[in-house]
Interface confidence: low
């Protein structure tokens, strides 16, 4: 936390963008090129975020906010502020050390991201298979055997997929 | 085989700075990050920060994020960690350890044997 | 910061004996969580990551659970060798964060 500073504080009139410099007499002087301060009274400028590597720049720095970084294309974001980037694969697979694999029977994965996840147990609920699982989709659950009466019909809904974006961050 | 060696203990005066060293070797030293991680004496684990050899990206534990700085020599395959303005509570044993590229699957798979850093006056 | 409270900090069991080690999130971590293993004057060695993928070379008898903010450490059938302090680590969010640990000692 930052304590709260005195009226007397000369530092507290210095606006975002620019720093409190005790080598010039607590003026306030711009930040430096490729540095930034997002709050009044600042007595350093923090260093601008540098999306180098497999991160590329999403929003460039400017004096008063940080550069914002996202991944470029095949991966995609983990962590608070996209602090890692992490290889996307194919629906239905997940990613390992050894690189993609296919989802093992009896688990799936409807993105191109995080981990295959066991298909739904059906009898849990009580409920029958109506349409079997993949490695790309869970199973749809309808109702339980003894709810079938005979000569009654139900119509299958397709599993429904989720956004891609809405998965583990 | 792929081995971390580590600089060996340190002692000193508050105030003052340290440059730990942690030499990579038996695997591609630009394709895993480096990270460091903090053990006081009798105490738990502390990850201080991070460094990608390939384009020395890091990621530092905003609690350290004034006094570490992380740099890589790849020329040596070997990872630099300094820690400014000892203090006493700084003491502790310190260990790099290493994470796979892109795939944040934090398994620190391979540690240095750690260096003990007293800060003592 | 996210906060890891692991539970117990110290526990006593018998050889042979089934042991749990609970770790708490102080928000969804989703399944990235690991369990470390340390011995006395050694470097952590890893467990499990993903919250239940054991490493290659671990013990079965080690396996790990939970999701989202609750996790589980289970040592099936304690044995001498598994004397130690366990810890759990988040890496959902940087900093990656651990718990304090649990010293498993043998009554």
């Known amino acids: 936390f930052e304590r709260t500073r005195s009226l007397q504080d000369p530092c507290s009139n210095c606006p975002a963008g620019t720093f409190c410099d005790n080598n010039r007499n607590q003026i306030c002087s711009p930040c430096p090129p490729n540095s930034f301060s997002s709050a009044g009274g600042q007595r350093t400028c923090d260093i601008c975020r540098q999306c180098k590597g497999v991160f590329r720049t999403r929003k460039e720095c400017s004096s008063t906010s940080n550069a914002e970084c996202d991944c470029t294309p095949g991966f995609h974001c983990l962590g608070a502020g996209c602090s890692m980037c992490e290889q996307d694969c194919k629906q239905g697979q997940e990613l390992t050390k050894k690189g993609c694999k296919d989802c093992c029977f009896g688990t799936f994965n409807d993105q191109k991201r995080g981990i295959c996840r066991p298909w739904t147990n059906c009898s849990l609920d009580g409920k029958s298979v109506l349409v079997n699982g993949t490695k790309e989709r869970d199973v749809v659950c309808g109702p339980s055997p003894a709810d079938l009466s005979p000569g009654a019909s139900s119509v299958t809904p397709p599993a429904p997929a989720r956004e891609p974006g809405h998965s583990p961050q | 085989q792929v081995q971390l060696v580590q600089s060996g203990a340190e002692v000193k005066k508050p105030g003052s700075s340290v440059k730990l060293s942690c030499k990579a070797s038996?695997?591609?030293?630009?394709?895993?990050?480096i990270n460091w991680v903090r053990q006081a004496p009798g105490q738990g684990l502390e990850w201080m920060g991070n460094?990608?050899?390939?384009?020395?990206?890091?990621n530092y534990n905003q609690k350290f994020k004034d006094r570490v700085t992380l740099t890589v020599d790849k020329s040596t395959s070997t990872a630099y960690m300094e820690l400014s303005s000892l203090r006493s509570e700084d003491t502790a044993v310190y260990y790099c350890t290493r994470t796979w590229e892109f795939y944040y699957d934090s398994v620190f798979d391979y540690w240095g044997q750690g260096t003990l850093v007293t800060v003592s006056s | 910061d996210i906060q890891m409270t692991q539970s117990p900090s110290s526990l006593s069991a018998s050889l042979g004996e089934r042991v749990t080690i609970t770790c708490k999130a102080s928000q969804d971590i989703n399944s990235y969580l690991s369990w470390y293993q340390q011995k006395p004057g050694k470097a952590p060695k890893t467990l499990i990551y993903r919250a239940n993928r054991l490493v290659d070379g671990v013990p079965s008898r080690f396996s790990g659970s939970g999701s989202g903010q609750d996790f589980t450490l289970t040592i099936s059938s304690l044995q001498p060798e598994d004397i130690a302090t366990y810890y759990c680590?988040?890496?959902?969010?940087?900093?990656?964060?651990f718990g304090g640990g649990t010293k498993v000692e043998i009554k």
């Open positions: 680590l988040q890496y959902d969010e940087l900093p990656p964060t």
């Open positions: 038996g695997y591609t030293f630009s394709s895993y990050w």
């Open positions: 460094i990608y050899p390939s384009d020395s990206y890091t």
